[in-house]
Structures are given as C-alpha cells and as structure tokens.
C-alpha cells in the first residue's frame, strides 16, 4: 500500500495508472467502499461521499491511462485509505493529512514563547523537526516549543513532518517584534547635538502603540521619564516631554530622538519601551550617553567623561605631534602645567578611538 502525506488546506493528487494507455472505466472509493468519483462514458461522475465537492480528476490524462484523484482544501479527516478500481485491479493509497499551526499570533514579542501544534490523523505517530531562520533545530512530537524567542528567530521556519519514511514540509512565517539592537551607546563631546535612533527589527502594515524613554542620569539620584509618545499608523506624536532636557522627536519611523546638546548632567543610560496595541508586553532598547569635557583651569588641563563606560576603556591626554601623553583607565585624566599646543583628549577601547576632543593650550608668559 502506497502512503501519501498531505498538508491541511493544500491540494493532493493520488495517482492511479492503467496498464493500457487508453481511456477506460475507473472508480475511486474510500475505505467504507463509498464511491467518490469515476468515469461513465466520457464524463466524470461523483458519488455520495463527503469529498464530492473537493474531488476532481485530470480528464486530459485519461487517454494516457492516468486516472488520478485530486483532493482540494485538504482536511485532517480526509486521512483514509483510498481505493482506485481500474482494469479489474485495485490500487490502495493511504492518505495522511497533517496540519501545523502556531498556537498564538505569529507576531510575537522578543522573549515570548512560540508553540507549534501538529494536527494529525488518529493512529499516526509522526515526528516533527523544525529549523529556525537562524539555523536552530528543534524536535518534537505533537507540540514544539521555543521558550524564548530571539531577534534572529524572525523569518520563515521550516518544519518537516515524518511518518512511515515519508515527509511533508511546512513553512511558517514568524515575526519577532523587537528593536534591531538591544543596546547602543552614543559618545559625544560636551555641547554637541545628540541623536538617538531606535530602529525596529520588523515591519508591520499598521503600527500603533505608545512609548516612553526613562532616563537615569549618572549624577541624579533617581530616574525620570524624559519623553512619552504616541505611535499611530507609523506616525509619531509627542504626548509629554521634560522641560530639561527638551528632547525633540521625529514624526516618522524609525523612532528618532534629538537632544539639543550633550551635557555632563545628561550622561547616563535610558530605557526606551514601546507598547504595541493588542500585544501583551513591551519592546525594550537600552541607550547610553557618554559625554566628554576637556577644560583648562589655571595650571591644570583636565579631561573628564561622564556616563556608563566600561573599566577597560582608556582616557588619554596627548599633545599633538609630541610624545607627551598621560593615560588612565579612569573617568578623568589631567596634566599639571601643560606645554603650549593642541592637546587631544581621547577615549579609546583597545586602541579604537570612541571619542575625541581637542583643546588649545596657549603659552603663559
């Protein structure tokens, strides 16, 4: 007996061939011997089965001795043994129809769980193997669970259902709702304009919700909400913004915030959250601001940074075109009685300069 696997909602073709390549009488019946379709004269006739409105045959192939039965919009309950009667012989085909669906919406927030459920005919014992767009392999039986979705899980999941050494492949599109980056750091000299960008890792036809940026300044004892905004069909409008700093926000996606100037009192870290309409939970992106200031006061040249810096970052003061350098893995460096000339303050990570500020020291007569 031949086994054919089908997918719920799809179309399947069960083949039946006569030895003689000519038009001849044939019938398709189910396991209960109820006629589904057949030929009478030159016409296709249908029996009283439940499949009658979804079953068909390729008339163009009859004269080649091919008497297939096509079943459209497959249902799990179509799983059965079908019998083709042609030329006084019977050919049996076992059809097994499977369905694989996501238990919830296929648009899920990062960190949420995804459950795929297999619908299968009674008596079958299939196995399922799924591969994520990022190459993650997951195996299971009737259900497959991905406990915590990551950004890279967004895309088409390919799942293979196996039964009796036959396979059928399902493709499920999963959209993980997240920001492109979990965290980002902006390095600025004091007084420079600061641009924060929060690009999304997905696109939706209709994007509505609300967002808020909470900020913990390094110098402040508590965090506060810097801005609250509305997102309606990808249009952004500010609901509430602090007086200091007076942030500005772009009206279109990607979410974009501008801080007029970087000041030491603003250095710190923020958390932008976005709540999407009809979704439980929020999207998060952390953003950090590091501010550098180079100053000369009397005989002291100082370079300072504020904000979240890692201990391995190096802060240096260096006289241009000269070897004079002072470096520290600290948030402030200074030189007493500096030589005249252009001094550079550099914040670097393993030799890579993250932030640079120049200050001119004039000779004192």
């Amino acid at each position: 007996k031949k086994v054919v696997l089908g997918k719920k909602g799809d179309t399947v073709e069960l083949t039946c061939n006569a030895s003689q390549k000519k038009n001849t009488q044939f019938h398709w019946k189910n396991s209960n011997q109820i006629k589904i379709l057949g030929i009478q004269g030159l016409f296709l006739t249908k029996g009283p089965s439940k499949l009658s409105d979804r079953a068909d045959s390729r008339k163009s192939l009859w004269d080649q001795g091919c008497f297939s039965m096509i079943i459209k919009n497959l249902k799990i309950e179509d799983s059965d043994t079908y019998i083709c009667e042609v030329e006084n012989k019977k050919e049996e085909v076992e059809l097994l129809v499977f369905g694989l669906t996501a238990n919830s919406d296929t648009h899920l927030l990062e960190g949420q769980s995804l459950t795929l459920t297999l619908e299968s005919p009674p008596g079958s014992s299939p196995s399922v193997k799924c591969r994520s767009p990022g190459g993650k392999n997951i195996q299971g039986g009737r259900t497959i669970s991905v406990p915590q979705l990551e950004r890279q899980d967004s895309g088409t999941w390919t799942c293979t259902v196996s039964q009796d050494q036959k396979t059928v492949e399902f493709k499920i599109d999963i959209v993980v709702l997240a920001f492109q980056k979990a965290s980002s750091t902006v390095y600025k000299k004091e007084g420079e304009q600061v641009e924060f960008s929060f690009p999304l890792a997905f696109t939706l036809e209709k994007l509505t919700g609300s967002g808020e940026l909470w900020w913990q300044a390094e110098r402040a004892s508590s965090s506060k909400s810097w801005i609250t905004f509305d997102l309606k069909n990808k249009e952004v409008s500010v609901k509430r913004v602090t007086q200091d700093p007076k942030l500005q926000m772009g009206k279109k996606l990607p979410l974009h915030l501008t801080l007029p100037q970087a000041l030491p009192q603003y250095a710190g870290s923020g958390n932008l959250t976005l709540a999407l309409e009809a979704k439980t939970g929020k999207l998060h992106q952390e953003v950090n601001l590091v501010v550098m200031r180079a100053t000369q006061f009397q005989e002291n040249l100082t370079c300072e940074v504020w904000g979240p810096t890692s201990p391995k970052l190096t802060l240096s003061l260096k006289l241009e075109n000269k070897g004079a350098t002072v470096s520290k893995q600290a948030k402030a460096v200074w030189v007493l009685n500096p030589e005249a000339g252009m001094w550079q303050c550099l914040l670097s990570d393993s030799g890579q300069v993250l932030l640079e500020s120049n200050i001119k020291v004039v000779p004192t007569w």
């Epitope: 609300s210 965090s223 909400s225 602090t242 709540a275 309409e277």
Partner: antibody, heavy 119, light 107 residues
Amino acid sequence: EVQLVESGGGLVQPGGSLRLSCAASGFTFSSYWMSWVRQAPGKGLEWVANINQDGNEKYYVDSVKGRFTISRDNAKNSLFLQMNSLRAEDTAVYYCAREGGQWLALDYWGQGALVTVSS
Amino acid sequence: DIQMTQSPSSVSASVGDRVTITCRASQGISSWLAWYQQKPGKAPKFLISGASSLQSGVPSRFSGSGSGTDFTLTISSLQPEDFATYYCQQANSFPWTFGQGTKVEIK
C-alpha cells in the same frame, strides 16, 4: 509598597483657603508626575491638576485656574494643593494620585481628604 | 475639552454574568484610555491603561478593547467583589476627563 496619604481637609467658608498635602512613600517620588482628582458627594470623578517631576510644568482644569496651585517638594516626598477663593462647588473628596506607565494612567491613589465649603 | 460618555449608567447583573461597559470619546484619543473601579467610600483602583493593557494583579476576567473613540470594558464572569462603579478616563489631552461612571449592581 506604594502609599499616598492626603491631609489638610476640613470645613471652610466660601472665599476661604485651604492647603492639602499628600505624603508619598514606597516609590521614587521625584521620578513621577502627580495629579489631584476630586469627587463631589454622590458624583463622578473630576481631574483637577497635575505637576511634572521637577515641579516646573503644571496643568489645571478650567474651573480651578487662577484659584488653585499645585506644587511639590521632592526632598520631602510631598505634593500640595493650595486652594484659594473656595466655592460651594469645590466641596469634594480630593485624591492625590501617581501617574505611572507610558499610557499616563493614575496607577496609585490616596484614600482622599474631604473638603467642605459651606457657610 | 474631550467629553467621555459611558453607557449604561447602571447595570444589574448576577454572579457569573458577562458585563460590558462602553465608553465613547467626543474626539479620537487613540488608545489613551484608562479604566478604574471604585467601591463606596474607597479610592478608585486602576484596572486598565492603553485601552487594553491590564494592570498587574488585576484578574484576567477584566479586559479592555477599542481605539479612537469607542472603548469597551468587559467582565467575563462577574464575581461578588466586582460590584462597584467603573470609570473610564482619557489621557490624550488636557484637561484629562472621566466618564460619568457605570454602577454594576446585584440583580
């Protein structure tokens, strides 16, 4: 545990003044906008005023503009409502409430202070 | 000012009933709507923000829906402790305004 406790309510004659206080605890008071909401006896809720974290941005309902002043003292975790030129229609239970979450809802409320304006 | 209109003003229901309260804004407020529950002599209690986001600790029998001008609060299976007055409130623009309230009474 977030707690808001109002005080300063009482009986006052029309045209008189009263100052309500709200003592906050269990959260970082200086991080949140705060509101006053009132409820006349047997009536619904009416939002009165709110103030931002730093105390430099304030909004009022038209019926109290020029008569009521909202203020705060972050060092003392306290919110205030100075009510002048009081009228009989200002009689109500006054609630202090915290504004929390990005949808600007009033997520925690005090138990209320009754203000009665009557001669 | 944005007017908020709740209906019905009161509803009589039994334990286990499904109760639906509607709130209509005089102009579009996107999802800037909150729902509160108030029992006699007590302060209001926050239930839902953003039209549909349930406050943590609020039973899942409460749900909110809607956007723009029309909003709904649904109690899927009324419990004895749910008999109270419910208010909607818009936070779209100042002054913030509340609906007149819907009293859920025991039938």
